[in-house]
């Protein structure tokens, strides 16, 4: 239904807390390298200018799209040109190319620096000092950081990341009470950003259907009780929220978000039996905890599937008159009865249906083409459990840290010209898989690992595309959303890689190496790896464990060392010489 | 084996009422459009109302609108047809159509009919 | 509404011949998103129901003999049986499912020479 004024109509819906933290997201995740202080004056305007429009819509420039004001104040930003280059093009364009060249722009690794935790006392005064700041600089820094974080859930992070301090900074220990929930924060927040970031990519390289898609699988695990309708309708509100943040349209996503959790909380009954606990939560914790609720159980006896979708005489009408929602209604009827596949694997079975029938409808006996089309599916399922069961045995026999060192080698080995620092992301990501995963049993660990090794893959999808090296991994990343992971791990050794010439600057290590956590010296000693399968692809996994062995005690004896300078730039010369003579390099 | 199986059909006076049914079997019935088609003694057919059996969404042709109302029981696998303020013009017989998955889908079957006639 | 107009309004023919039934639309029931034609043909024998033939224009119903065809597109539909035989003796029908209220030609009588 159409406003007068949108802005009006926002900041009514979402009232103004929530308004100016949207505006702040929004703005942040567009200009990442804006400095704070410039952003809260901005979103101050806006807010400003909001409220004049609630008084009386139809003030002057009340009536304006919420891209053109935004995109309107994001242009007076003196600094765009020198700040942003190319980006201050985008001010020359009209509506709606102007937010496009402005979504293009978003930078998914940003050139800003590390994000340093203060002592706990510092935080604690900032905190009290001013709480409103400290906590609009916090979503700021995460918005800039990660500008497709889903704004909604940042505003529920926030929530308790405010909780955390008000309870933490009171406490006898601030720093046993806060740095955990600090730790599970920071940790919960890359995982939401990797996951949102996917579901961007999904909609923004694969389109609409592609999404679609996904959402029917995954709801249709989670609501198997739920009939067809009911599932479309939250596939279609939930593809609209997800379109909206995605085109940085926060303050509707957020708001159709609302009205969503609503939505299924009015009709649970209809829905899900598990949602009961969710829907008494305050709105944010909510639309979290719906988004995060664990599967219905299955109705009992459902019917085979091969009534509707193999032996009815119906199937090629049905195709051919409605192709989305007969296959929609093929992919419902699986998933529902499948929480034990992932999510892709159930979006290869229907693609591997869709082609079956795209083939057999047109045949002389469609039937009879199409006939053994489910025994089609046994390989495609296969293939995922017998490289789970082999992986999950290799990282039960390795632990994490070796088992992260493995995929590095292996990754390193299939795709040598990517970054370091990307190989090294994605493979401690990957290797991840490991602990979150590998402790489930047999029914939940195709869904937990193959789930989230396309959200891990997407990531060095992104962070591939902003700077091309490799063309298979372009090809991996492009051709097909749902076989990203199996054209990954296909891949054998890159035979046309010429080794990266031996530099010792990247071998040589200091003492300060001692002072790092321990997350910090494994990432040292990982990046040391990759520039040595960079420098030598073709070293055994023996001749790379010999060396890694031999620089992991080099590192602990210098630590220990009274002249630990003296001892990382003598010991060091000797390590690199060893290591070249045992690679042959 | 497909079946649809109209009944309810009868002798009614002008200004009366009639609820026919269709019961469905050998097919997933809440899966498609069910129809109501009828066809006046020497005439051609005349779709009379539609319903997506999944969601509950009606249509209705113009001469019956706002007197007849389609629905249906998933659960018993049923269609119904209630008729109220009937016409002579009403008078024909009626057929149950299961249509596709969409509302301009073909009606792959077709029930044997059920005779109305709104006579004084 | 859409009108659905069929010509002729009948039609004799002897076994072995063809006959084609011609549907005209008032308006186009090419659907723009996947490119097809919401049109189907039935047939409706004495004293019996009628039966789907023909959708999307020109997809054959399973179990129909292979001499029925329909083709055409947007506005202008044909039917085609290629070599008529003694069962094919019925009123046929046009119907678009393009738009609601859905409608129905007023149907051709074919009857044996």
């Known amino acids: 239904d159409a406003h007068k004024s949108e802005v009006a109509h926002r900041f009514k819906d979402l009232g103004e807390e929530n308004f100016k933290a949207l505006v702040l997201i929004a703005f942040a995740q567009y200009l990442q390298q804006c400095p704070f202080e410039d952003h809260v004056k901005l979103v101050n305007e806006v807010t400003e200018f909001a409220k004049t429009c609630v008084a009386d819509e139809s003030a002057e420039n009340c009536d304006k799209s919420l891209h053109t004001l935004f995109g309107d104040k994001l242009c007076t930003v003196a600094t765009l040109r020198e700040t942003y280059g190319e980006m201050a093009d985008c001010c020359a364009k009209q509506e709606p190319e102007r937010n496009e060249c402005f979504l293009q722009h978003k930078d998914d690794n940003p050139n800003l620096p590390r994000l340093v935790r203060p002592e706990v006392d510092v935080m604690c005064t900032a905190f009290h000092d001013n709480e409103e700041t400290f906590l609009k600089k916090y979503l700021y820094e995460i918005a800039r950081r990660h500008p497709y974080f889903y704004a909604p859930e940042l505003l529920f992070f926030a929530k308790r990341y405010k909780a955390a301090f008000t309870e933490c900074c009171q406490a006898a220990d601030k720093a046993a009470c806060l740095l955990p929930k600090l730790d599970e924060l920071r940790d919960e927040g890359k995982a939401s950003s990797a996951k949102q970031r996917l579901k961007c990519a999904s909609l923004q390289k694969f389109g609409e259907r592609a999404f679609k898609a996904w959402a029917v699988a995954r709801l249709s695990q989670r609501f198997p009780k739920a009939e067809f309708a009911e599932v479309s309708k939250l596939v279609t509100d939930l593809t609209k929220v997800h379109t909206e943040c995605c085109h940085g349209d926060l303050l509707e996503c957020a708001d159709d978000r609302a009205d969503l959790a609503k939505y299924i909380c009015e009709n649970q009954d209809s829905i899900s039996s598990k949602l009961k606990e969710c829907c008494e939560k305050p709105l944010l914790e909510k639309s979290h905890c719906i988004a995060e609720v664990e599967n219905d159980e299955m109705p009992a006896d459902l019917p085979s599937l091969a009534a509707d979708f193999v032996e009815s005489k119906d199937v090629c009408k049905n195709y051919a008159e409605a192709k989305d929602v007969f296959l929609g209604m093929f992919l419902y009827e699986y998933a529902r009865r499948h929480p034990d596949y992932s999510v892709v694997l159930l979006l290869r079975l229907a693609k591997t249906y869709e082609t079956t029938l795209e083939k057999c409808c047109a045949a002389a006996d469609p039937h009879e083409c199409y006939a053994k089309v489910f025994d089609e599916f046994k390989p495609l399922v296969e293939e995922p459990q017998n490289l789970i069961k082999q992986n999950c045995e290799l990282f039960e026999q390795l632990g994490e840290y070796k088992f992260q060192n493995a995929l590095l080698v292996r990754y390193t080995k299939k795709v040598p010209q990517v970054s370091t620092p990307t190989l090294v992301e994605v493979s401690r990501n990957l290797g991840k898989v490991g602990s979150k995963c590998c402790k489930h049993p047999e029914a939940k660990r195709m869904p937990c690992a193959e789930d989230y090794l396309s959200v891990v893959l997407n990531q060095l999808c992104v962070l591939h595309e902003k700077t091309p090296v490799s063309d298979r991994v372009t090809k991996c990343c492009t051709e097909s959303l749902v076989n990203r992971r199996p054209c990954f791990s296909a891949l054998e050794v890159d035979e046309t890689y010429v080794p990266k010439e031996f530099n010792a600057e990247t071998f040589t290590f200091h003492a300060d190496i001692c002072t790092l956590s321990e997350k910090e010296r494994q990432i040292k000693k990982q990046t040391a790896l990759v520039e040595l399968v960079k420098h030598k692809p073709k070293a055994t996994k023996e001749q790379l464990k010999a060396v890694m062995d031999d620089f992991a005690a080099f590192v602990e004896k210098c630590c220990k060392a009274d002249d630990k300078e003296t001892c990382f730039a003598e010991e060091g010369k000797k390590l690199v010489a060893a290591s070249q003579a045992a690679l042959g390099l | 084996e497909l079946q649809l199986v109209e009944s309810g059909g009868g002798l009614v006076q002008p200004g009366g009422s009639l609820r026919l049914a269709c019961a469905a079997s050998g097919f997933t019935f809440s899966r498609y459009w069910m129809h109501w088609v009828r066809q006046a003694p020497g005439k051609g057919l005349e779709w009379v109302s539609g319903?997506?059996?999944?969601?509950?969404?009606?249509a209705y042709a113009d001469s019956v609108k706002g007197r007849f109302t389609i629905s249906r029981d998933n659960g018993k696998n049923t269609l119904y047809l209630q008729m109220n303020s009937l016409k002579s013009d009403d008078t024909a017989v009626y057929y149950c159509?299961?249509?596709?998955?969409?509302?301009?889908?073909?009606?792959?079957?077709w029930g044997q009919g059920t005779q109305v006639t709104v006579s004084s | 509404d859409i009108v659905m107009t069929q010509s002729p309004s009948s039609v004799t023919a002897s076994a072995g011949e063809k006959v084609t039934i011609n549907c005209k639309s008032s308006?186009?029931?090419?659907?723009?998103?996947?490119?097809?034609?919401?049109l189907a043909w039935y047939q409706q024998r004495p004293g019996q129901s009628p039966r789907l033939l023909i959708y999307?224009?020109?997809t054959r119903e399973s179990g129909v003999p292979d001499r029925f065809s329909g083709s055409g597109s947007t506005t202008d539909f044909t039917l085609t049986i290629s070599s008529f035989q003694p069962e094919d003796v019925a009123v046929y029908y046009c119907q678009q499912g393009y738009d609601v209220p859905v409608t129905f030609g007023q149907g051709t009588k074919v009857e044996l020479k």
């Open positions: 319903i997506n059996t999944g969601t509950g969404s009606t």
């Open positions: 999307l224009a020109s």
């Open positions: 308006r186009s029931v090419l659907y723009s998103s996947n490119q097809k034609n919401y």
């Open positions: 159509a299961k249509g596709g998955l969409v509302v301009g889908g073909g009606y792959s079957d």
